[in-house]
Interface confidence: low
């Protein structure tokens, strides 16, 4: 058993048939010694008396809010949550496996630049009685500070018969060093509580590996005289790290016909302009990637050829 | 070439070669995203590899103030990785394919280090690992880890030289 926060405790249970469970001793937070009784949740049934209560926690029916009273007055509460371990593996029932980039990916994170700011998100089909808390650090044996905000519901989607809820959180490394080569990964830890079930999820990454620039901005076309060619120009996204002479991007320019089956023409360039042939009804798209480290490409920025 | 006493390197040549190093490092190990090497050992996996750290003066401001600190750190790293790529870790079994970019990568690391430090001028270098993994699979894993670490190192070096070429070239 360990304390998650004040008056909230997590009991770690091996979840197998006939498991003996965990013996837990609860102590009433009071100077009183006599006349103390214990109840569980809303029930008025007295579970025991005295300053301490010993219980055997085996299943969710044994978890909940234990309250000690004296003469009708509430003295203190202890909320017991369960963390299940089945076949040696902690349960991951609350969050959905996003399966990208690999199986057992519950948390996904992205950064728009090297400032030490990043966003993580996760999915669940649970809509009520759900709380999350997020902690993060750089490294684990001698952790350096990362500050995370509160997790918020950021999107709702219908997937077949199910509703899916996306939660996200923004974090910022306290003493970020954008130009340095990271040697210790960022660790993100999410505590999830659904009713009386506790689970924790972790992700470990380098900022450089989760970089995904915003799409290039101000994408413009300039027709070239007496030619089917156009000059495409664009700018670095505002959110990208500066100076751009140091934090450079590379770009992919694509000409795509109306039909998805039509052949795509692609040009790669380090410049912020390119000359391409504009076909009728086609569109021109540009996306960006870190020039020196192959993290994710940005989404496309597009303009129609006409 | 960098000259003892702290004159400027050939920023543009260094820029071109460091960008080539980035390309080679990724072609030598393109599967980076698909193999989470940190699962094989937590934050200290490549803990003696020379990293370009916050205090090494490789940020734009530090380069403007005095690029020598940063160039020395980059040189140290280049020599370190050049020795690693020439070691038993890469030359032993399982053999690299004849057209593997590792050979080119090795030569380019040496080339860039020589651009930074002419003969006869010696910056202190970090001691080089003398590990000879006993199992081929260990060697393979170690190669992945080294290449992954090298990708991060050369990315920072390339930024430094790109910025130097754009802002510090005579």
């Amino acid at each position: 058993i360990w304390e998650l926060k004040k008056d909230v405790y997590v009991v770690e249970l091996d979840w197998y048939p006939d498991a003996p469970g965990e013996m837990v001793v609860l102590t009433c937070d009071t100077p009183e010694e006599d006349g103390i009784t214990w109840t569980l949740d809303q029930s008025s049934e007295v579970l025991g008396s005295g300053k301490t209560l010993t219980i055997q926690v085996k299943e969710f029916g044994d978890a909940g809010q234990y309250t000690c009273h004296k003469g009708g007055e509430v003295l203190s509460h202890s909320l017991l949550l369960l963390h299940k371990k089945e076949d040696g593996i902690w349960s991951t029932d609350i969050l959905k496996d996003q399966k990208e980039p690999k199986n057992k990916t519950f948390l996904r994170c992205e950064a728009k630049n090297y400032s030490g700011r990043f966003t993580c998100w996760w999915l669940t089909t649970i809509s009520t009685d759900l709380t999350f808390s997020v902690k993060s650090s750089r490294g684990s044996s001698d952790p350096q500070g990362v500050t995370c905000g509160a997790a918020t519901l950021s999107a709702e989607r219908v997937r077949g018969d199910n509703k899916e809820y996306e939660y996200s959180v923004e974090c910022q490394e306290d003493s970020a060093c954008p130009a340095a080569e990271e040697s210790l990964p960022i660790e993100v830890m999410v505590d999830a509580v659904h009713k009386l079930k506790y689970e924790n999820y972790t992700s470990s990454f380098f900022i450089r590996d989760i970089i995904k620039p915003d799409p290039p901005k101000n994408l413009q076309l300039k027709p070239l005289k007496n030619s089917r060619q156009v000059e495409v120009s664009w700018e670095y996204p505002d959110t990208w790290s500066t100076p751009h002479s140091y934090f450079s991007l590379t770009f992919c320019v694509q000409v795509q016909g109306k039909s998805k089956r039509e052949k795509k023409d692609r040009v790669f360039t380090d410049k912020t302009s390119a000359t391409v042939i504009c076909r009728k009804n086609a569109s021109i798209s540009v996306r960006a990637q870190d020039r020196y480290y192959s993290s994710s490409w940005s989404e496309w920025a597009s303009v129609p050829c006409s | 070439r960098a000259v003892p006493g702290g004159s400027s390197p050939a920023w543009t040549q260094c820029q071109q070669l460091s960008q080539k190093l980035c390309t080679l490092a990724w072609s030598a190990h393109p599967l980076v995203g698909h193999m989470d090497l940190r699962e094989e050992g937590d934050e200290e996996t490549t803990n003696d590899v020379p990293h370009i750290q916050c205090g090494d003066g490789c940020d734009p401001q530090g380069l403007r103030d005095n690029s020598q600190f940063c160039l020395q750190r980059i040189h140290q790293g280049l020599i370190f990785y050049e020795k690693l790529l020439g070691s038993d870790i890469f030359t032993g079994e399982p053999s690299l394919l004849p057209d593997s970019p590792v050979g080119q990568l090795h030569a380019s690391l040496l080339g860039l280090s020589q651009l930074l430090q002419p003969e006869g001028h010696h910056w202190e270098t970090q001691q080089i690992p003398s590990l000879s993994p006993s199992q081929p699979w260990q060697r393979l894993l170690l190669r992945f880890k080294i290449l992954r670490s090298l990708q991060a190192f050369v990315a920072v070096a390339a930024r430094v030289f790109a910025h130097g070429a754009a802002t510090l070239s005579p």
Epitope: - | G41, D42, T45, D48, G55, P129
Partner: antibody, heavy 114, light 112 residues
Framework: EFQLVQSGAEVKKPGASVKVSCKAS????????MNWVRQAPGQRLEWMGV????????TYNQKFKGRVTITVDTSASTAYMELSSLRSEDTAVYYC???????WGQGTLVTVSS | DIVITQTPLSLPVTPGEPASISCRSS???????????LNWFLQRPGQSPQLLIY???TRASGVPDRFSGSGSGTDLTLKISRVEAEDVGVYYC?????????FGSGTKLEIK
């Protein structure tokens, strides 16, 4: 639980060599550097050197001028410190300590006496 | 090599009273990353050293909050707010700012 268990006490003659072992358990051995520190009777602690078990890279205290060799056997999760050309002033307790110096072995007493 | 000068050599203290140990470094242990690379250890009689404080002021896990570390890059202090009987032993500071790592000469804390 992290543990570093060292080999037993040794008595050596001047000029001989001694090899002390340090077996690690409770963590991934290759993830953390291993330091060696010694303490002569009534003296301050003295850092001898460090090894990165992942690569076998070592850094030594120059005071020991080539007399100290630190090695590892990763398959056995064990680090070794060998000190050669022993003299009476090498009589000390020798400790291994994991990166960060938060975990130490129990110490190995090496006595050098003719 | 960085030389660490530790004072006092011996420190007799009455239980419940505060105690303070100083270490002076021949070179600043404050790095550009803002961290000061100094450890404090307690070595009880017949035992291995135990890490108390790392990075000048961060308590190692399980170390009581009566122990605190402070200082500048070169002048560093370990304070015990109220000495208890279990605190007896030799206290060492250690710099890990550069190789070779070096230790102070030690301060023997004893109960009056």
């Amino acid at each position: 639980e992290f543990q570093l268990v060292q080999s037993g006490a040794e008595v050596k003659k001047p000029g001989a060599s001694v090899k002390v072992s340090c077996k690690a358990s409770g963590y991934t051995f290759t993830d953390h550097n291993m330091n060696w520190v010694r303490q002569a009777p009534g003296q301050r602690l003295e850092w001898m050197g460090v090894i990165n078990p992942n690569y076998g890279t070592t850094t030594y205290n120059q005071k020991f001028k080539g007399r100290v060799t630190i090695t590892v056997d990763t398959s056995a999760s064990t680090a070794y410190m060998e000190l050669s050309s022993l003299r009476s002033e090498d009589t000390a307790v020798y400790y291994c300590a994991r990166r960060g110096f938060a975990y130490w072995g129990q110490g190995t007493l090496v006595t050098v006496s003719s | 090599d960085i030389v660490i000068t530790q004072t006092p050599l011996s420190l007799p203290v009455t239980p419940g009273e505060p105690a303070s140990i100083s270490c002076r470094s021949s070179k600043s242990l404050l790095y550009k990353d803002g961290k000061t690379y100094l450890n404090w250890f307690l070595q009880r009689p017949g035992q291995s050293p135990q890490l108390l404080i790392y990075l000048m002021s961060t308590r190692a896990s399980g170390v009581p909050d009566r122990f605190s570390g402070s200082g500048s890059g070169t002048d560093l202090t370990l304070k015990i707010s109220r000495v208890e009987a279990e605190d007896v032993g030799v206290y060492y500071c250690q710099q890990i700012a550069e190789y070779p790592f070096t230790f102070g000469s030690g301060t023997k804390l004893e109960i009056k």
